[in-house]
């Protein structure tokens, strides 16, 4: 009998609010013996496969996900989802990643340390649902992101 | 890296068949494959498609006509009861590397043929 | 359902001219939006995806732009070897299911 898989978690490092420029690392986390996560973004066709997973605690498994140079286009929802042979999980909640101008003055937001999206939730009713369409981007005063439908 | 259809034959209406759509050279499990028909002088018309995560869509038109299964190397397309508008060569194909929106790799196609 | 209309159903033009095929979408479809070749006996090329990433070995002559419901193919240098049917599909799966629809079809003649 196949086990039931726990949904991942995805978690941002620094953290969610990023300025242009910067680098972000994406965190995804299942139990052992995943064989592939995958990154995927809300609304864009494109995704991230990476067979790079170590083992995090003896329970958990961890994969990471590194932009380089975060730019506008970056910003959006993201999720995790793994491959524990011989099937899938189902996908993680949602994280937001927001992209602020570097022009900004004292005011502007820090960064927010360590935010995740874990498995808090049972999957909503389009969560079977692996693309699911979101609205296009917003742009805020000084903030890129995407607003998210819940 | 390649997918190749293979069951189509002539068939008279009614009849069940299977079509089979089998991978090699690459790991079936990260791939959607999609199921497309061509009629005789006719366009590309979607049938259906095996997501990675196991999901299976289909046309509006295809439902309840066709079922799509898959196993770890092969996506199988059933045509539960066939009728002569079904005669098309029928091709699977598999998603680009890294992106949903594009479907790179097909197969040569295969022919059904439904008449009496 | 997702209708796609694709325009015009054919077109001819000369060799070293510019051809361009468009493609509406009933309803938006952000980025998951890609065109084909198909040449007759054989299986469709992929040409452009995502919905304007050029596919491996396809020359920078072909060009795919637009997004959410509006796309555009531009072919320009036109050789006899474009002569072929080009269609546009959306792959989009979504909260309301919109995947895998092809346009009618464009039939490109060189002359």
């Known amino acids: 009998q196949e086990e039931d898989l726990p949904r991942p978690s995805i978690s941002a490092e620094p953290g969610t609010v990023i300025p242009l420029g910067s680098h972000v690392t994406f965190v995804c986390r299942g139990p052992v013996g995943v064989q592939t996560f995958r990154l995927e973004r809300e609304s864009r066709s494109t995704y991230n496969d990476t067979e790079d997973v170590s083992q995090a605690s003896p329970s958990e498994s961890e994969a990471r996900f590194r932009i380089d140079s975060v730019s506008e286009g970056n910003a959006g929802p993201y999720r995790c989802i793994y491959y524990k042979p011989p099937k899938w999980s189902e996908q993680s909640d949602y994280l937001e990643l927001l992209v602020k101008e570097t022009s900004g003055g004292p005011d502007s937001p820090d960064t927010e340390p360590g935010s995740s999206a874990g498995p808090t939730q049972r999957p909503s009713d389009n969560s079977h649902n692996e693309h699911a369409p979101a609205s296009q981007g917003l742009k805020a005063e000084h903030l890129y992101h995407h607003h998210h439908h819940h | 890296a390649a997918v190749k259809e293979s069951g189509g034959r002539l068939v008279t209406p009614g009849t069940p068949l299977t079509l089979t759509c089998t991978a090699s050279g690459f790991s079936l499990y990260k791939y959607n494959i999609q199921w497309v028909r061509q009629a005789p002088g006719k366009g590309l018309e979607y049938i259906g498609a095996?997501?990675?995560?196991?999901y299976t869509y289909y046309a509006s038109w295809a439902k309840g006509r066709v079922t799509i299964s898959r196993t770890s190397t092969t996506v199988d397309l059933k045509m539960t009861s066939p009728t002569t508008e079904d005669t098309a060569t029928y091709f699977c194909?598999?998603?680009?590397?890294?992106?949903?929106?594009?479907?790179?790799?097909w197969g040569p196609g295969t022919l059904v043929t439904v008449s009496s | 359902e997702l209708v796609l209309t694709q325009t015009p159903a054919s077109v001819s033009a000369a060799v070293g001219g510019t051809v361009t095929i468009k493609c509406q979408a009933s309803?938006?479809?952000?980025?998951?939006f890609a065109w084909y070749q198909q040449k007759p006996g054989q299986s469709p090329k992929l040409l452009i995806y995502?919905?304007?990433k050029l596919a491996s070995g396809v020359p920078p002559r072909f060009k795919g732009s637009g997004s959410g419901t509006e796309f555009t193919l531009t072919i320009s240098d036109l050789e006899c070897a474009d002569a072929a049917t080009y269609y546009c599909q959306s792959t989009y799966f979504g909260v309301d299911y919109l995947g895998g629809t092809f346009g009618g079809g464009t039939e490109v003649e060189i002359k």
């Open positions: 095996s997501t990675y995560a196991g």
């Open positions: 309803q938006s479809i952000g980025t998951w």
């Open positions: 194909a598999r998603h680009i590397d890294g992106d949903y929106s594009g479907y790179a790799l």
């Open positions: 995502g919905p304007s």
